[in-house]
């Protein structure tokens, strides 16, 4: 069984998101993204910024889905 990471905030998640950022990250700061493992207790989209920070976001937020679509298209 996959154990959840000890990262308890929206920043620097190693495996799972426990909380989500409350701020919309400017699109130009985002370099990449990945989805957290389905075994995590909560779903999460992790955006990686150009400065190398990883930020947990809520997949149900429209801006998150818009960014994902934009990155898939480009």
């Amino acid at each position: 069984t996959k154990t959840e990471s000890s990262s308890r905030g929206p920043y620097h998640p190693s495996e799972c998101c426990f909380t989500y950022t409350t701020y919309k990250i400017p699109r130009q700061r985002i370099m990449d993204y990945y989805e957290t493992n389905s075994q995590c207790s909560k779903p999460g989209i992790v955006f990686i910024t150009k400065r190398g920070h990883s930020v947990c976001t809520n997949p149900s937020d429209k801006w998150v889905q818009d960014y994902i679509k934009d990155m898939k298209e480009n």
């Epitope: 149900s60 889905q65 679509k69």
Partner: antibody, heavy 121, light 106 residues
């Protein structure tokens, strides 16, 4: 006119598998998300899961081990499959659609009438 | 997980009066709160989102307010048609609904 409608529920036995279909009219699933929510008799609303406008499904923590949400964009339908039913799954099941107009896809302004699912031996 | 605790049912008000329904979250939800109205045998109807913004087509006598962990739905100039169950929903964290508050119009 935009609307969603759930398929007929009915009577199920414990350990059965439930399959419900949400048929969408007046909009495309390619630009809408579908949420599944249920309501036990006399109780509050309970979120089950949702499928995004790009087709990714997400689930409530309690539901993810036995629920699957899929969609068919050609037929404009979304399907909820829930396995290992128990009496506690007796509820009215709703599908609800949203295009993110309210900043979050969990906020739904288009709801079906709901369909009653009864689990009993 | 967030727990939403609503005003106990029933809440009654005379026609033309004011009704207040409260929703308390167990942790801060940053105004990510919606209110729904549900009548017997019908699906929920979205009234308020982002704690205070009126959904499309909802009369202005419905007002949402609050922040942090405390949120309120106020109905001014109550009409008979407002008799229903009102539920709050948090969408900051895990998409949890409150248990609902029944409003009775006398």
């Amino acid at each position: 006119c935009q609307s969603v409608k759930e398929s007929e529920g009915g009577l199920f036995k414990p350990a059965d598998t439930l399959t419900l279909t949400c048929t969408v009219s007046g909009f495309s699933l390619s630009s809408f998300a579908i949420n599944w929510v249920r309501q036990a008799p006399g109780e509050g609303l309970e979120y089950i899961g949702w499928i995004s406008d790009v087709g990714t499904a997400y689930y409530a923590s309690w539901a993810k081990s036995r629920s699957t949400i899929t969609r068919n964009t050609d037929e404009n339908t979304a399907t909820l499959k829930m396995t290992s039913l128990t009496a506690a799954d007796t509820a009215t099941y709703f599908c609800a659609g949203g295009d993110g107009s309210y900043s979050n896809y969990w906020v739904s302004d288009i709801w079906g009438q709901g369909t009653l699912v009864t689990v009993s031996s | 997980a967030v727990v939403l605790t609503q005003t106990a049912s029933p809440v009654s008000a005379p026609v033309g009066g004011t009704v207040t329904v409260k929703c308390q979250a167990s942790q801060t939800i940053n105004n990510r709160l919606a209110w729904y109205q549900q009548k017997q045998g019908q699906p929920p109807k979205l009234l308020i989102y982002e704690a205070s913004k009126l959904a499309s087509g909802v009369p202005s006598r419905f007002k949402g307010s609050g922040s942090g962990t405390e949120y309120t739905l106020t109905i001014r100039g109550v009409e008979c048609a407002d008799a229903a169950t009102y539920s709050c929903q948090e969408y900051a964290d895990e998409n949890i609904f409150g248990g609902g508050t029944e409003v009775v119009v006398k």
